[in-house]
Interface confidence: medium
């Protein structure tokens, strides 16, 4: 069986939320059992069509209505022929969208006027991703390349911080971190606290 992907480039870049149909053409077999494979695992769902063009020419379609980051990867189709599995050339599917946060600023409790740090990291594609920092409704830092650490010399009241990630597809806003004031026991001096408070909160879920 001559097996090839039809009309699809080796690298396919699609914007998040857009539809994609991957095509696979199988010639030289009367009844191919076409399987789609993503990153080595057979795609086990019904988002597939198999169309006989002629007796020995079939086209398989893998249809994705609205791609998201988890759909990115290496796709190929395969058929069994005489006990051997033949595989097609792969298609690399890249899903582009607004930045996705891998680290967002975390809530902290710090003594008055004590220095602390907040972390923010976001990824594409597309890259590069730049970070802008906000204190309440005031822009206070950036744009700087991701990842970014905001060094704050101290606060005297509970304050809200957030970061914004930008790339060619647009921007995404992080969660808002609240930095609370730690109650300091009488007799201790707040400005003697020089240790840094790190924020490295991971946000694995991706919500469309």
């Amino acid at each position: 069986a001559g097996l090839k992907l039809m009309g699809a480039p080796v690298k396919l870049t699609v914007s998040q939320g857009q539809p994609v149909k991957l095509n696979c053409s199988v010639e030289g077999m009367e009844e191919p059992d076409i399987q789609w494979v993503k990153d080595g695992a057979v795609v086990q769902n019904l988002d597939q069509l198999y169309i006989p063009v002629s007796e020995q020419h079939w086209i398989g379609f893998l249809s994705l209505k609205s791609v998201e980051r988890s759909d990115a990867g290496r796709y190929w189709c395969q058929v069994e022929d005489g006990g051997e599995t033949e595989i097609s050339q792969p298609v690399w599917l890249t899903v582009e969208g607004v930045p996705f946060f891998t680290v967002e600023p975390k809530d902290l409790a710090v003594p008055p006027n004590a220095p602390f740090q907040l972390s923010c990291e976001a990824v594409g594609p597309p890259e590069p991703v730049t970070i802008v920092w906000w204190r309440g409704t005031t822009k206070i830092g950036g744009p700087a390349p991701s990842p970014s650490v905001l060094n704050v010399t101290g606060v005297t009241q509970s304050t809200m911080f957030s970061c914004e990630a930008h790339n060619l597809k647009g921007l995404a806003s992080s969660r808002t971190a609240t930095v609370h004031l730690q109650l300091v026991p009488r007799g201790s001096s707040a400005h003697h606290h020089h240790h840094h408070h790190h924020s490295a909160w991971s946000h694995p879920q991706f919500e469309k």
Partner: antibody, heavy 125, light 108 residues
């Protein structure tokens, strides 16, 4: 012309076994999937499961898994829906449906379906 | 198990626009299909892949999908459009199909 010819209406008692059939013509049976769809009297449509004539690979809806068996005979281009032990709640019209697609210009699939006329199954003591 | 939710009934006057909705958590990722079933007849595919009209279906029938909601629109409904309409889609897992509960369209 694509045709799906279903077996005639049947009346059975609870606990009886039954097989109904759907014979396909006008196309290559092994090229397509055939689904079975249930419609109880005065109620909506329910997808039961499907079989691909080519490899007799089957898929079932969660409500029907284990209660019915879908099979096919390639030599006669016929799909079957089988019960080992009928219940009164199985009383319904059963449709077989051929799923299909054609290509326009060789790359864009256009979806279509052919439905059989239905087989009425009545289960009553 | 996965469900698609439709309103039980929709009524319009002849010439008005009828809209029938179908909601399901997987619809942002799975295509919706629409069937028309007239009394005593087998269903007919009207719309496939959210918005594509099946061959032989009048242009007044259209489909759309946004988020978790798919919509069948009949612009200028006619008396002969009176029927039950069902949406149909893949489950969130993609392993089985599901019909909505059906909507009875009355064209008064």
């Amino acid at each position: 012309e694509v045709q799906l010819v279903q077996s005639g209406a049947d009346v059975k008692k609870p606990g009886a076994s039954l097989t109904i059939s759907c014979q396909a013509s006008g196309y290559t049976f092994t090229d397509y999937w055939i689904s079975w769809v249930r419609q109880k009297p005065g109620k909506g449509l329910e997808w039961m499961g499907q079989i691909r004539g080519q490899h007799s690979s089957t898929l079932y809806g969660p409500s029907f898994q284990g209660h019915v068996t879908i099979s096919a005979d390639r030599s006669t281009a016929t799909a079957y829906l089988q019960w080992r032990s009928l219940e009164a709640s199985d009383t319904a019209m059963y449709y077989c449906v051929r799923h299909g697609a054609s290509t326009s210009g060789g790359t864009i699939p256009e979806y279509y379906q052919h439905w059989g006329p239905g087989t009425l199954v009545t289960v009553s003591s | 198990s996965y469900e698609l939710t439709q309103p039980p009934s929709v009524s319009v006057s002849p010439g008005q626009t009828a809209r029938i909705t179908c909601s399901g958590d997987a619809l942002p990722k799975k295509y919706a299909y629409w069937y028309q079933q007239k009394s005593g007849q087998a269903p007919v595919l009207v719309i496939y892949e959210d918005a594509k009209r099946s061959s032989g279906i009048p242009e007044r029938f259209s489909g759309s999908s946004s988020g978790t909601m798919a919509t069948l629109t009949i612009s200028g409904a006619q008396v002969e459009d009176e029927a039950d309409y069902y949406c149909y889609s893949l489950s969130d897992s993609g392993n089985y199909f599901v019909f909505g509960g059906g909507t009875k369209l009355t064209v008064l």
